[in-house]
């Protein structure tokens, strides 16, 4: 990767981070009456998430994420869940590259939507701070 492509990657990661934080803030909104119900849904967590290729694991969970977000009141988000997830999917596909043979491995234990989002927020923050 060139310095310009790395800069683009950084910007995409920052966009991804903001989207994930927006979702988390939306579902954690004290006015969200569906939060208890949303927390009953389980998400698969990556066995490891340190590099861009591990975004394969996030991509595979975007459809379940959209389904859970559809439960929330739309006014908690600036965009409809379908559009929000579509935006994230575009970013993830660009970031993880075309290494289609790379298969995700998941941790043994599942997580709530809050734990899931926090994991990918941590991932995004760490890549932003260490990508050179």
């Amino acid at each position: 990767p060139t310095s310009s492509s790395t800069k683009k990657t950084q910007l995409q990661l920052e966009h991804l981070l903001l989207d994930l934080q927006m979702i988390l803030n939306g579902i954690n909104n004290y006015k969200n009456p569906k939060l208890t119900r949303m927390l009953t849904f389980k998400f698969y967590m990556p066995k490891k998430a340190t590099e861009l290729k591990h975004l394969q694991c996030l991509e595979e969970e975007l459809k379940p994420l959209e389904e859970v977000l559809n439960l929330a009141q739309s006014k908690n988000f600036h965009l409809r869940p379908r559009d929000l997830i579509s935006n994230i999917n575009v970013i993830v596909l660009e970031l993880k590259g075309s290494e289609t043979t790379f298969m995700c491995e998941y941790a043994d234990e599942t997580a709530t939507i809050v734990e899931f989002l926090n994991r990918w927020i941590t991932f995004s923050q760490s890549i932003i701070s260490t990508l050179t």
């Epitope: 340190t50 861009l52 760490s126 890549i127």
Partner: antibody, heavy 117, light 107 residues
Framework: EVQLVESGGGLVQPGGSLRLSCAAS????????LAWVRQAPGKGLEWVAA???????YSPDTVRGRFTISRDNAKNSLYLQMNSLRAEDTAVYYC???????????WGQGTTVTVSS | DIVMTQSQKFMSTSVGDRVSVTCKAS??????VGWYQQKPGQSPKALIY???FRYSGVPDRFTGSGSGTDFSLTISNVKSEDLAEYFC?????????FGGGTKLEIK
């Protein structure tokens, strides 16, 4: 059998440069993330840099801007270009393979870098 | 950065004994923890991954456990060749960080 063999260490003056190499064999080199980890005399281990299979590079604040990790998949080789060296960079530098889903599973024997005037 | 703390720098044990080396993470790292053995004058050797899984060829005397923030490496029936320094490492997120190490001394 997986093998990692480092070379290129030596004595260098503060502010100088050095290029370390790591020759790999026994596995599909291009499919793995590789890392450099260092160990100062009598101290613990410190992660220095990593490069993934797409050649994206990662490093901590302590060396960013001074150290550059790179790879040549055709030669099954990993490199660490170290510039603006400081006394605190004195250490044994290890090349390690980062398994896709787990820890650093194979390590080289190390090469010693001494920064002193 | 995540700080990995091995509070005991040295541990003394006898051949045949059982000893546990502990490691604490400054934040939740799930089970993304590895353990390494470094014998004097040698490079580190991977023993444990995912907190509790042994690498191929590692004797079953070595057992890893823990999740979240507290981890341990237990060596049962200690042998003289276990004289080494043991390091934990988190690979939950970059930058990877290591514990300061625990030197095992054989009485």
């Amino acid at each position: 059998e997986v093998q990692l063999v480092e070379s290129g260490g030596g004595l260098v003056q503060p502010g100088g440069s050095l290029r370390l190499s790591c020759a790999a064999s026994g596995f599909t080199f291009s499919s793995y993330t590789l890392a450099w980890v260092r160990q100062a005399p009598g101290k613990g281990l410190e992660w220095v840099a990593a490069i993934d299979s797409s050649s994206y590079t990662y490093s901590p604040d302590t060396v960013r801007g001074r150290f550059t990790i790179s790879r040549d998949n055709a030669k099954n080789s990993l490199y660490l270009q170290m510039n603006s060296l400081r006394a605190e960079d004195t250490a044994v530098y290890y090349c390690a393979r980062d398994s896709n889903w787990d820890a650093l599973d194979y390590w080289g024997q190390g090469t010693t870098v001494t920064v002193s005037s | 950065d995540i700080v990995m703390t091995q509070s005991q720098k040295f541990m003394s044990t006898s051949v045949g004994d059982r000893v546990s080396v502990t490691c604490k993470a400054s934040q939740n790292v799930g089970t993304n923890v590895g353990w390494y053995q470094q014998k004097p004058g040698q490079s580190p050797k991977a023993l444990i991954y995912s907190a509790s899984f042994r690498y191929s060829g590692v004797p079953d005397r070595f057992t890893g456990s823990g999740s979240g923030t507290d981890f341990s490496l237990t060596i049962s029936n200690v042998k003289s060749e276990d004289l080494a320094e043991y390091f934990c490492q988190q690979y939950y997120t970059y930058p990877y960080t290591f514990g300061g190490g625990t030197k095992l001394e054989i009485k």
